[in-house]
Amino acid sequence: AVDLTLLANLRLTDPQRFFLTCVSGEAGAGRGSDAWGPPLLLEKDDRIVRTPPGPPLRLARNGSHQVTLRGFSKPSDLVGVFSCVGGAGARRTRVIYVHNSPGAHLLPDKVTHTVNKGDTAVLSARVHKEKQTDVIWKSNGSYFYTLDWHEAQDGRFLLQLPNVQPPSSGIYSATYLEASPLGSAFFRLIVRGCGAGRWGPGCTKECPGCLHGGVCHDHDGECVCPPGFTGTRCEQACREGRFGQSCQEQCPGISGCRGLTFCLPDPYGCSCGSGWRGSQCQEACAPGHFGADCRLQCQCQNGGTCDRFSGCVCPSGWHGVHCEKSDRIPQILNMASELEFNLETMPRINCAAAGNPFPVRGSIELRKPDGTVLLSTKAIVEPEKTTAEFEVPRLVLADSGFWECRVSTSGGQDSRRFKVNVKVPPVPLAAPRLLTKQSRQLVVSPLVSFSGDGPISTVRLHYRPQDSTMDWSTIVVDPSENVTLMNLRPKTGYSVRVQLSRPGEGGEGAWGPPTLMTTDCPEPLLQPWLEGWHVEGTDRLRVSWSLPLVPGPLVGDGFLLRLWDGTRGQERRENVSSPQARTALLTGLTPGTHYQLDVQLYHCTLLGPASPPAHVLLPPSGPPAPRHLHAQALSDSEIQLTWKHPEALPGPISKYVVEVQVAGGAGDPLWIDVDRPEETSTIIRGLNASTRYLFRMRASIQGLGDWSNTVEESTLGNGLQAEGPVQESRAAEEGLDQ
């Protein structure tokens, strides 16, 4: 199980001193930025127990493996469900703490109930402040059951849940009708997925026999040990004030674990620390009792004394839970509670024993989970112990589970169970990812998802040219860093594969799938220079350039012209896709803009050195359109145009341009210049009689401006065919007077 503990500090006289701390003993827990370890999360869960909103709670991280929640201002802030989430991937685990108000109408006799599948669970709510009305039981926030207030037995309302199944797990509450939710009794029911003493997918495997109140996990068969106990079967007590799977954590404060509630991963739930009991975990165990919630009885024999934290303390010459075993009885010594091996390895396992008579090689045996008994291949006999060495046949996954070392002599027998975890070496599920490439190197991300077991100790990257039969080159890299493959050939495909390893002998996994990564072309080395440029309009620029002459073929696919508009902070890129090109027309530029211009040769995706830059100023754009253009037929060959000057001119007009076109005609329009810019009238002559014409005009300063509106007018009838339109202009007033 994940080593995750949620501690609640129950100093309820002062809510502001109340805190919740989530502590992880997992390697790399809570780092967050590390790809191998997501952060610890600690929060109030308002989905089921909805209480009035309070001020936001403060979350403080203390190092990488601890997070604390503070900021409770009043007792009602504490009521409800809190959860801590830790562990990575499939081991991600949620630990839940349920807090009851000490002033509630109803109080739980016991908050956490862990039961086996098929058991009958009984939740008991004690009346603290009576109300003469119905009691409503809820399950996970939804109505479940009703009791009349007369149905209390010895001042308690009982909810019996026969034949419970895992879906019955959750938060239960007992509430008086019409009473505040803060007055409810809240419970947590945990239903193991198997019957008593069983675990595994079909509940076919036998639990190791957890001691000292440990609970067998229905998925992996491990004992979840109460706070203050450790070992595969929780057989070993921690020193007072310590907790965690390896007793590595210490209770804060001078009073040790007093006043702390400990919540552990399901199916354990919550309890006081070892040596303490009561709703606020502030009462020491009564004589003869020990352990979490003081649930265990010592029953020491042979002069043993009861310690409320660890149980029986035996006098010399005796050992065992109740000091019931004489030291003459053989005893397994210093057996590790858990061993880890990689699949298909053939490890050696040692088992040491002492006793009187002295154990010999044949008296020590090793039993696998399937019942197979292994005999030792050799034994090392020392004055105080015999160590038997067992050569284990090639391991398979089914060998995972509880193994047992057993010693038998005429003085009696002893056995010690230990857990063997057979781990599958990791195999990449995906190919490595190409990050960047150059002509002679590839930068690769080797971190990929994998099947099998972590942690990843080493990553090997194997690579060789595609379709090559030469040996693979190998580079060993750090799992969390990107790798640069160097000294490669340009424009060459390489087959690249990842191999992952986990710790221990035989931890190397199979190679992952290959991927093809291709190095880039050679970089173009020639630096062009700009020969010249000229403006072909307010938004058009023609550019020409040259390249130095070098022997051999030109390494390049084309040119990239870059125009930098510093004022607007914009760059324009123009791709010239022929390496033979030495000129280009750039259009659609912004009139009146100062550009910095350069050119560079490219090859594949690589750019060569840029030319020295040139600075180009495009002329500004033309003026606005003339206003109120009007056409009036004067004869069968003449039409007079009148207009008003454009507004907001950027400078003096140099001329006007009139466009003349026969309405509906297919031919090109005719443009006529009006070279006297002060004019506001002109006569277009030489038109055809009885013909409809379209006119529009624009002004010019340094460039042509916008067109005016288009006007239509027809010449008068009965005239002869004209030579073609010509223009005569004079001041508008004069024209009109005539």
């Epitope: 909805r50 009305t133 119905d134 409503i136 009791l147 009349d148 149905e151 019409e178």
Partner: antibody, heavy 125, light 108 residues
């Protein structure tokens, strides 16, 4: 869909007995409080009796206490009302109803949203 | 034993607003629940709690509570609202249920 169907009503002489049944469907019968309410012709509604989910607690209106017995069979999803020593004033349409519970700002409250169509009991000589 | 008291009859013009009241000591501890009953039919829940309507009940029905009095208000009464209206709560002992005597609403 919650459904309640009463049966067992009819004509009975004063001093006689009758047993009403209410068949429930569409919900988990064993989790809910049930009750009988009656309505004499042209009169208002009158609560008769309630029974809690386990059947372990019952309550009665003073007017029927000692004569009527409410019971339930959770395995058959059925509510019963055994009526003894019937009187003319027991003539009424008898409805069975189910308690419902709702959450109002965290406070749990009760109402009776689901009713049967009623069965008529006539006590007359 | 506490009782719930209602006016026997109330009338309202079509489209107008009418208020039906229910008085009793138990209403100091419990909200009134209101039921509508039309001739030959089972009662139908219309208002419960502070002012909650089951689905299907028009929003012209509303409830309120003050002291020992619960009220049912119909804003813009319709012809189909003509029916008997009953209030209900627990009695002060918490075990018995009480129904008011009913109010016959006529829509003119």
């Amino acid at each position: 869909e919650v459904q309640l169907l009463e049966s067992g009503g009819g004509l009975v002489q004063p001093g006689g007995s009758l047993r009403l049944s209410c068949a429930a469907s569409g919900f988990t019968f064993s989790q809910y409080k049930m009750l009988w309410v009656r309505q004499a012709p042209g009169k208002g509604l009158e609560w008769v009796s309630s029974i809690y989910p386990s059947g372990g607690w019952t309550s009665y209106a003073d007017s029927v206490k000692g004569r009527f017995t409410i019971s339930r069979d959770n395995s058959k999803n059925t509510l019963y009302l055994q009526m003894n020593s019937l009187r003319a004033e027991d003539t009424a349409v008898y409805y069975c109803a189910r308690a419902s519970y709702y959450d109002s700002g965290g406070y749990y409250r009760e109402n009776f949203q689901f009713w049967g169509q009623g069965t008529l009991v006539t006590v007359s000589s | 034993q506490s009782v719930l008291t209602q006016d026997p009859a109330v009338s309202v013009a079509l489209g107008q607003t009418v208020r039906i009241t229910c008085q009793g000591d138990s209403l100091r501890s419990y909200y009134a629940t209101w039921y509508q009953q039309k001739p030959g039919q089972a009662p139908v829940l219309v208002i419960y709690g502070e002012n909650n309507r089951p689905s299907g009940i028009p929003d012209r029905f509303s409830g309120s509570s003050s002291g020992n009095t619960g009220s049912l208000t119909i804003t813009g009464a319709q012809a189909e609202d003509e029916a008997d209206y009953y209030c209900n709560s627990r009695d002060t002992s918490g075990s018995h249920l009480l129904f008011g005597g009913g109010t016959k609403l006529t829509v003119l």
